[in-house]
């Protein structure tokens, strides 16, 4: 049976959701040896109904809030080993907020809060713009929100300010929330590595390009800023 007399350790990790895509809100707990003794409840600050409930080995969604209907799941196969993470389908801007992962097992009960940020972030791609009159690089990233900053850097001219020789534009995407980021860097020199860095309060992404006489090398990297 479920006693819930003692406190158990529940651990969450602050995370970010990419709107329009599926997200995961991480939560782990001290495992129990019997699935039927585990109850997982996900709650959100300011939301009346439950986000998700999993008990006696299955989802119990009778008290689920309308805004989460048909959009949540847990990794049921992993609950027995202490994984209570919530899967969230089609992340919305309004899903941002403070969530509570509340666990009851035969060993006791415990909870932990999690800050969930939502926005849009994508990997940039840097290309040589052959249509331009001078040597030009074009950095494009399809989906960002909130509006990010774009900074160019180069390996040769470290610390140089490229704002005078670059131009950045933001084009609203069809869903009227996220934006396409396009930044152009002029007067580039050969045998140099240039980096296009896009950043907002959720994510930081970098697209690198190295242009030599014989080849072009590219590399991209994306990092969520609030993930510990």
């Amino acid at each position: 049976g479920i006693s819930g007399r003692h406190s158990i350790t529940v651990t969450t990790v602050a995370s970010a959701g990419n709107i329009g895509e599926d997200g995961i809100l991480s939560c782990t707990f001290e495992p129990d040896i019997k699935l039927s003794d585990i109850v997982i409840q996900w709650l959100k600050e300011g939301v009346l109904g439950l986000v998700h409930e999993f008990k006696e080995g299955k989802d119990e969604l009778s008290e689920q809030d309308e805004m989460f209907r048909g959009r949540t799941a847990v990794f049921a196969d992993q609950v027995i080993v202490g994984n209570a993470s919530l899967r969230l389908k089609n992340v919305q801007l309004t899903d941002a907020g403070t969530y509570k992962c509340y666990i009851i097992t035969s060993k006791g009960k415990g909870n932990a809060n999690l800050e969930y940020k939502t926005g849009a972030f994508s990997m940039p791609e840097v290309n040589v713009d052959y249509n331009a009159s001078s040597e030009t690089l074009r950095c494009e990233a399809p989906r960002w929100f909130p509006q990010p900053t774009v900074v160019w850097a180069s390996q040769v001219d470290q610390g140089a300010n490229f704002s005078e020789v670059s131009n950045t534009s933001f084009e609203l995407n069809s869903e009227n929330v996220t934006m396409k980021v396009v930044s152009v860097l002029y007067n580039v020199t050969i045998n140099n590595t240039y980096s296009c860095m896009i950043e907002n309060d959720i994510a930081k992404a970098t697209g690198d390009i190295k242009v030599t006489e014989s080849e072009i090398k590219r590399r991209s990297h994306l990092q969520l800023l609030n993930s510990k």
């Epitope: 599926d22 040896i33 699935l35 039927s36 999993f54 080995g57 299955k58 989802d59 969604l61 949540t72 799941a73 847990v74 990794f75 049921a76 196969d77 609950v79 027995i80 080993v81 899967r87 389908k89």
Partner: antibody
Framework: QVQLQQSGAELMKPGASVKISCKAS????????MHWVKQSHGKSLEWVGY????????SYNQKFKGKATLTVDKSSSTAYMHLSSLTSEDSGVYYC????????WGQGTLVTVSA | DIVMTQSPSSMYASLGERVTITCKAS??????LSWYQQKPWKSPKTLIY???SLADGVPSRFSGSGSGQDFSLTISSLESDDTATYYC?????????FGGGTKLEIK
């Protein structure tokens, strides 16, 4: 208790295709992966693959890639396995199942491939 | 692929006897192992999940132990209803693989 109800037995000609269904009752369909398992007559069990009802993602045993296609219909809490280009080697009982945790199994669907 | 070697492949035991079936994985699968009981013309029934957890409705005479590569299913006191074929399954790494089965009959 979660019940998994499978469709009835199928007698098929070589070269034909068949689609087997597995309907889950008394639970929300998205938290468990739905696995499919084959049992040839008098033999052990073979894992075919699973479908993740949350996003439709799949994982297959290499042996069944190109032979089996796993899908789900969340609105009816039903999983499907489509078997193509049937040969006598595909004859057997196919089970849908939740493998880990509350591991329930369907009653099985007998597929017989015969000219 | 991970190979699950189950032994014995068949055995006879007396009522009330303690019976142990083993499964050895070709590599570490932690505790990602389940045990199933199958009777003729029936679908498998889960006995043990995650190596040691007893499935709901399964008599307490069944128990599972082990982790890593070596696992066992024990029936503490054999009953006539336990005549069946028993299978282990590793679900630690894709493709999931079953043992060859152990056919258990009463002496």
């Amino acid at each position: 208790q979660v019940q998994l109800q499978q469709s009835g037995a199928e007698l098929m000609k070589p070269g034909a295709s068949v689609k087997i269904s597995c309907k889950a009752s008394d639970y929300s369909f998205t938290s468990y992966y739905m696995h499919w398992v084959k049992q040839s007559h008098g033999k052990s069990l073979e894992w075919v693959g699973y479908v993740d009802p949350f996003n439709g993602g799949t994982s297959y045993n290499q042996k069944f890639k190109g032979k089996a296609t796993l899908t789900v219909d969340k609105s009816s809490s039903t999983a499907y396995m489509h078997l193509s280009s049937l040969t006598s080697e595909d004859s057997g009982v196919y089970y849908c199942a939740f493998i880990a945790g509350f591991a329930n199994w369907g009653q099985g669907t007998l597929v017989t491939v015969s000219a | 692929d991970i190979v699950m070697t189950q032994s014995p492949s068949s055995m006879y035991a007396s009522l009330g006897e303690r019976v142990t079936i083993t499964c050895k994985a070709s590599q570490d699968i932690k505790s990602y192992l389940s045990w199933y009981q199958q009777k003729p013309w029936k679908s498998p029934k889960t006995l043990i999940y995650y190596a040691t957890s007893l499935a709901d409705g399964v008599p307490s005479r069944f128990s599972g132990s082990g982790s890593g590569q070596d696992f066992s299913l024990t029936i503490s006191s054999l009953e006539s209803d336990d005549t069946a074929t028993y299978y282990c399954l590793q679900h630690g790494e894709s493709p999931y693989t079953f043992g060859g089965g152990t056919k258990l009959e009463i002496k």
